[in-house]
């Protein structure tokens, strides 16, 4: 999970650094998880499609009082061009399945790494 080869580059910090940091934060969360993440809180599952950054934020923003994902919540706001508020539900959600935050984080991490392998990052 920690192998993020290809991210390092000399010179000015590229915009993709933000993405590297998001992936690394998700890795940290999955690796450092001892007790159930966010006390086993459940969030809406999302479609891991083109709107996933906003969808992920929309789902996770409804989890409060969980310091483990606060940084992820802040970071995702940098990837979502739209305003996202707690309690908001747009067409981004499947909204028929709820999963634990820990599983949500793992799914998001795997998808981001898959996109990276496919060369989807500039």
């Amino acid at each position: 999970l920690t192998c993020l080869g290809g991210f390092a580059s000399p010179g000015p910090v590229p915009p993709s650094t933000a993405l590297r940091e998001l992936i690394e934060e998700l890795v940290n969360i999955t690796q450092n998880q001892k007790a159930p993440l966010c006390n086993g809180s459940m969030v809406w599952s999302i479609n891991l499609t083109a709107g996933m950054y906003c969808a992920a934020l929309e789902s996770l923003i409804n989890v409060s009082g969980c310091s483990a994902i606060e940084k992820t919540q802040r970071m995702l706001s940098g990837f979502c061009p739209h305003k996202v508020s707690a309690g908001q539900f747009s067409s981004l959600h499947v909204r028929d399945t709820k999963i634990e935050v820990a599983q949500f984080v793992k799914d998001l991490l795997l998808h981001l790494k898959k996109l990276f392998r496919e060369g989807q990052f500039n």
């Epitope: 083109a50 709107g51 906003c54 061009p81 981004l92 060369g119």
Partner: antibody, heavy 120, light 109 residues
Framework: EVQLVESGGGVVQPGRSLRLSCAAS????????MHWVRQAPGKGLEWVAI????????YYADSVKGRFTISRDNSKNTLYLQMNSLRAEDTAVYYC?????????????WGQGTMVTVSS | EIVLTQSPATLSLSPGERAILSCRAG??????LVWYQQKPGQAPRLLIY???NRATGIPARFSGSGSGTDFTLTISSLEPEDFAVYYC???????????FGQGTKLEIK
Amino acid sequence: EVQLVESGGGVVQPGRSLRLSCAASGFTFSSYGMHWVRQAPGKGLEWVAIIWYDGSNKYYADSVKGRFTISRDNSKNTLYLQMNSLRAEDTAVYYCARLWFGDLDAFDIWGQGTMVTVSS
Amino acid sequence: EIVLTQSPATLSLSPGERAILSCRAGQSVSSYLVWYQQKPGQAPRLLIYDASNRATGIPARFSGSGSGTDFTLTISSLEPEDFAVYYCQQRSSWPPVYTFGQGTKLEIK
């Protein structure tokens, strides 16, 4: 009715500046990411820039980076494109477009466009 | 930057016929592909998002398919109002850079 109306186009000499405006109505402008897209006469579409709902992030096409600046005034429901050091190849119809909430790839609402001609 | 190549450049068909438009990406864009229709003197109109989902108000005769690098827009039975230019478009995952294909002109035979 959801609407975007561009203005500010015209004829300008190379090296000069121009500011385009896009007035939004019929939706909560302050909640949406917005874009500028252009189309040279008889040519295809070219993405120019994106701005976050609150102006916190902005990204540009390489062809305009360092010369164009996208901005917005949410209190006026208006999107702007400041174009400096204009070149002949910037001649195009400029469209503002709303980034669809359901899909970060798709532009669901477009303005009618405003023509910018760069010529000496 | 991911390059999108559309083919054919021009497609000449008659009303009632089936139109198949192709868009090929220089590298995988997963399913993050969008199709637009543009008529002369008008702004583009969103047709298909995520490669295969019809936007609101788009007739069922329009369908999209494909993933990875090869995508297709199919119009099952052409109506007179369908003759226009069609563009495919994608976004790199990060930073957000948007690319359009060069367009396919669908004209009346």
